[in-house]
Interface confidence: medium
Amino acid sequence: FGISGKHFITVTTFTSAGNIGEDGTLSCTFEPDIKLNGIVIQWLKEGIKGLVHEFKEGKDDLSQQHEMFRGRTAVFADQVVVGNASLRLKNVQLTDAGTYTCYIRTSKGKGNANLEYKTGAFSMPEINVDYNASSESLRCEAPRWFPQPTVAWASQVDQGANFSEVSNTSFELNSENVTMKVVSVLYNVTINNTYSCMIENDIAKATGDIKVTDSEVKRRSQLQLLNS
């Protein structure tokens, strides 16, 4: 939270995570001010000379923008008057991680707040029945992760069981030489059971569930960002 009091306004940020190679958002809100021309938004990054982004007098001012952010930043211009100073960041890179400051000045006062931005790669897992194996097995695949995650299996029937002895996990480096494809195979699965493949690093946790019965296969996946 930012500072508040006389001539200061409350600025709020949220720790967030960016997915390498995709577009991300650094969240920042402030006390609204209907006078758009009086609002100044500055985004700064610790260790970087120059600005990440500046918005003032109702438009972007990129004259002091640092080269590494050129052509990669945008505010939600139509939402500035309602107190949204969030920054869109295009083509998130590992090097974008760090501490950012959202600085706001309006006719009501000024304020700022810091934001910790984490970067990595995370993706939804997909579980399929592997009919090619000698015994029935499940194959859990997720295309993009970084840093290298841990993978664990669980089952509804055998709650608390350790599946490390009957599973095999591999990590294959993707073509851009940063992110990796995660593949985990669980052997000797039984029918009429729900299995979960859980992939987790310090940025995100993803779970893929599969329920295999005689008549059908049901799947569900979910992804949650950690510390957000």
Epitope: G21, G71, K90
Partner: antibody
Framework: QVQLQESGPGLVKPSETLSLTCTVS????????WGWIRQPPGKGLEWIGY???????SYNPSLKSRVTISVDTSKNQFSLKLSSVTAADTAVYYC????????????????WGQGTTVTVSS | DIQMTQSPSTLSASVGDRVTITCRAS??????LAWYQQKPGKAPKLLIY???SLESGVPSRFSGSGSGTEFTLTISSLQPDDFATYYC?????????FGGGTKVEIK
């Protein structure tokens, strides 16, 4: 309807500076990105750089030390200067307009000039 | 710089054919891809931006798809006016780079 027209010398001597101007007619230069792209004979397209109407620029790193792009909003023009040219700079030079989300012409280039051929030769 | 690879480099087709051109990026570019058409002696013309958004005035037989590193331009029914060279271009990070081009010629 917005139209772009490149102008400048068609022949430049090696080691000299290539100077081109793009005139925007039928619309304003304000609030758009304005780029220069070139195409050597029989080859593909190469970005040189772009400028926003406010004056902020981005240049292709392979040409950055030799390139300057400037804008004159009062004349509805923007210009390209490429110094220390060699025969490898012989190409058709296009100016183009772009718009986008991320303070860059990342929604493509929707209006182009017809191109001007520049030959570098002594 | 991000490398863009187009295939095929030349494509022979007939009027009415469904034509597909592929563009691959050397790293993920999300959906930041544009497609252009160029005819000999003319400037390129924007067809598609943001991978799948059709530029105003472009016939609906042109469509774009893909995200990440693999993209396609499809012409659902090739018309006489469509014989040209097609370029993809990543808009993800500067310098924006073009593919080598795909020439669509009459079979």
């Amino acid at each position: 309807q917005v139209q772009l027209q490149e102008s400048g010398p068609g022949l430049v001597k090696p080691s000299e500076t290539l100077s081109l101007t793009c005139t925007v007619s039928g619309g304003s230069i304000i609030s758009y990105y304005w780029g220069w792209i070139r195409q050597p004979p029989g080859k593909g397209l190469e970005w040189i750089g772009y400028i926003y109407s406010s004056g902020s620029t981005s240049y292709n790193p392979s040409l950055k030390s030799r390139v300057t792009i400037s804008v004159d909003t009062s004349k509805n023009q923007f210009s390209l200067k490429l110094s220390s040219v060699t025969a490898a700079d012989t190409a058709v030079y296009y100016c183009a307009r772009g718009s986008g989300l991320y303070a860059a012409p990342d929604y493509g280039l929707d209006v182009w000039g017809q191109g001007t051929t520049v030959t570098v030769s002594s | 710089d991000i490398q863009m690879t187009q295939s095929p480099s030349t494509l022979s087709a007939s009027v009415g054919d469904r034509v597909t051109i592929t563009c691959r990026a050397s790293q993920s570019i999300s959906s930041w891809l544009a497609w252009y058409q160029q005819k000999p002696g003319k400037a390129p013309k924007l067809l598609i931006y943001k991978a799948s958004s059709l530029e105003s005035g472009v016939p609906s037989r042109f469509s774009g798809s893909g995200s990440g590193t693999e993209f396609t331009l499809t012409i659902s029914s090739l018309q006489p006016d469509d014989f040209a060279t097609y370029y993809c271009q990543q808009d993800n990070s500067f310098p924006f780079t073009f593919g080598g081009g795909t020439k669509v010629e009459i079979k």
